[in-house]
């Protein structure tokens, strides 16, 4: 039975992931029985990615490490639509590390997953980035401009946003 063997395969795959994420929320994408995409519970999903808001306050390096042990990275924001989705889950009085840094302090910003940094798809607050010693990026809320990015010192503990590709089963 085709459906039965598919289900057995799926269950064995789900068991593989349980040591990292005990619970996954899966949806059938499109009409093809092949395409089930999953995010860990209680991560949120948007397009082909899963997102997790980490409320623990850590440095940028520790925040990236925290994401990586879950199979994720600090968030890479590729579009305005993606940012609009992310901010729905953020608190206005908090700041969150992004997967964006300038390790050399020469304004060569780079994303953690090597996505090319595109000046045309950035959402810096006005006047930012403004300090060569502030080499890590956060997203925060300013009443005058709503949500945007700011450069800060990497060692200053912040909340963070993790992003991973959906898990396909």
């Amino acid at each position: 039975n085709f459906m039965y063997s598919k289900t057995v395969k799926r269950l064995s795959k789900l068991r593989e992931y349980q040591q990292y994420h005990p619970s996954l929320t899966c949806v059938m994408e499109g009409k093809d029985i092949e395409d089930w995409s999953c995010c860990p519970t209680p991560w949120t999903s948007f397009q082909s990615s899963c997102y997790f808001i980490s409320t623990g306050m850590q440095s940028w390096t520790k925040s990236q490490k925290n994401c990586s042990v879950m199979g994720a990275d600090l968030v890479v924001i590729n579009t305005r639509e993606e940012q609009d989705f992310i901010i729905q889950n953020l608190k206005r009085n908090s700041s969150y590390f992004l997967g964006l840094s300038d390790p050399g302090g020469r304004r060569h910003w780079q994303w953690v997953d090597q996505t090319p940094y595109n000046e045309n798809v950035t959402f810096w607050h006005s006047g930012e980035p403004n300090n060569l010693d502030e080499r890590c990026a956060i997203i925060n809320f300013r009443s005058s401009e709503e949500w945007g990015w700011n450069d800060i010192h990497c060692h200053v503990p912040q909340k963070s946003i993790c992003k991973m590709k959906k898990i396909y089963i």
């Epitope: 593989e16 992931y17 990292y20 990586s68 879950m70 199979g71 991973m164 898990i167 396909y168 089963i169």
Partner: nanobody
Amino acid sequence: QVQLQESGGGLVQPGDSLRLSCTASERTFTNYAMAWFRQAPGKERDVLATISRSGSSTFYAESVKGRFTISRDNTKNTVYLQMNSLEPEDTAVYYCAARPLVPSEDPDNYNYWGQGTQVTVSS
């Protein structure tokens, strides 16, 4: 079941370069962290390099740091090991391996293995 197939091994001279490839049958390749290991005759299987699902995080063993580079192309379901400045001590069978979500340096933590490809460095 993830099936892995290595290619690119062979006989080279000291100082030469080789690029190994490992292609996965699994269409859900991006679910997996990948690694390269090697095993010389009578020795343990040693980790050389690991790479995260997105390719953002890599690890290298001290013995190959600066000479070997791991990378992956998720559109081709393939992971690569670029090996430069090869030495006779690099002679071994090279294996790629896959595990769900998070890389590890311990071979016991990998669920899926290729058959291996022989690399011989000799003048």
